[in-house]
């Protein structure tokens, strides 16, 4: 884990992140809320909106076409991961070829998980952990042999299951609500400021 002095306004040491957060004017569409202070470059933000982008060669449409309503949550999830300078309290060292740090147990506001889960109910997948177990032989992820495509709710029976399991417990569902100052919002209106700054401060204090 990081020294307790380095929990606020930091970028993780991963594949595409800046070394330090800074303003980034040209952030694309759903990543634009982070433009005042960002860990991602403009080009990363553009790639976050593409299918099978160069970022991770990840195929959202591995079980047929993912609905736009569902896909926008995965784009937002990517924007949060790549751009947020407010995830310091949950950064952990990791021994992986493609990154030195990851996030673990970020307390996502319960409404963000609920909305994600509801909007993906008509989309299909074949796995509950999207970090591992894929067939990458084609250069992008495909369902492994024997993994059947089912609606999201089959692999993620609750919103909590979706948020906690999909990326190896990078997230957990908070009992707190949006606006409480105690949970991270994947979605926010930058006109009203970035609510995750206060959340990071709260947990950084709690950890010190």
């Amino acid at each position: 884990a990081r020294p307790r002095t380095e929990l606020l306004n930091v970028c993780m040491d991963a594949k595409h992140h800046k070394e330090k957060p800074s303003p980034e004017d040209g952030l694309h569409k759903q990543c634009s809320p982070w433009k005042k202070n960002s860990c991602c470059f403009a080009n990363t933000s553009r790639e976050a909106h593409k299918d099978i982008s160069y970022l991770y060669r990840f195929n959202w449409n591995h079980c047929g076409s993912m609905t736009p309503a569902c896909k926008k949550h995965f784009i937002q999830d990517t924007c949060l991961y790549e751009c947020s300078p407010n995830l310091g309290p949950w950064i952990q060292e990791v021994n992986q070829s493609w990154r030195k740090e990851r996030i673990l147990h970020v307390p996502l506001c319960k409404e963000d998980c609920e909305q994600w889960w509801q909007d993906c109910r008509t989309s299909y997948t074949c796995k509950s952990n999207w970090h591992k177990g894929w067939n990458w032989t084609s250069g992008y992820n495909q369902c492994p042999e024997g993994a059947a495509c089912h609606p999201f709710h089959f692999y993620f029976p609750t919103s909590a299951a979706l948020c906690s399991e999909i990326w190896s417990h990078s997230y957990k569902v908070s009992n707190y609500s949006r606006g409480s100052g105690r949970c991270i919002q994947m979605w926010f209106d930058p006109a009203q400021g970035n609510p995750n700054e206060e959340v990071a401060r709260f947990y950084a204090r709690a950890m010190s």
Partner: nanobody
Framework: QVQLVESGGGSVQTGGSPRLSCAVS????????MGWFRQAPGKEREGVAG???????????YYADSVKGRFTISQDNAQRTVYLQMNSLKPEDTAMYYC????????????????????WGQGTQVTVSS
């Protein structure tokens, strides 16, 4: 302060499909959270559907389990109106239906919480008879 005017209620048969409308004035409509709520006699007001109208990815909608698959909330930016299309109505859907709005960015179950809203319409009665 946002002004809201509902219309479209009335008496319908079981299985009917009325559409409620909520006209918005007094606010730049592009970024609002709006909800449809209902209150039957002797019962608490409950959220049935909500929509966040703004943001870089377009509107986001959320539904109570009791109406999922039967009701659809939508918006018409040009008309500054939010609609609730109600299908396959049942007698237990009988209630006064209210439209509510707030400038807060609400999603998920937050869209269905009455305490989150600061502007309310007068309501329109929907009566479902068998």
């Amino acid at each position: 302060q946002v002004q809201l005017v509902e219309s479209g209620g009335g008496s319908v048969q079981t299985g009917g499909s009325p559409r409620l409308s909520c006209a918005v004035s007094g606010h730049t409509y592009s970024r609002l959270s709006m909800g449809w709520f209902r209150q039957a006699p002797g019962k608490e007001r409950e959220g049935v559907a909500g929509i966040y109208t703004g943001g870089p990815s377009g509107p986001m909608t959320y539904y109570a389990d009791s109406v999922k698959g039967r009701f659809t909330i939508s918006q018409d930016n040009a008309q500054r109106t939010v609609y609730l299309q109600m299908n396959s109505l049942k007698p237990e859907d009988t209630a006064m239906y209210y439209c509510a709005a707030t400038p807060q960015f609400l999603i998920g179950s937050g869209l269905l919480r009455p305490d989150k809203y600061n502007s309310w319409g007068q309501g329109t009665q929907v009566t479902v008879s068998s």
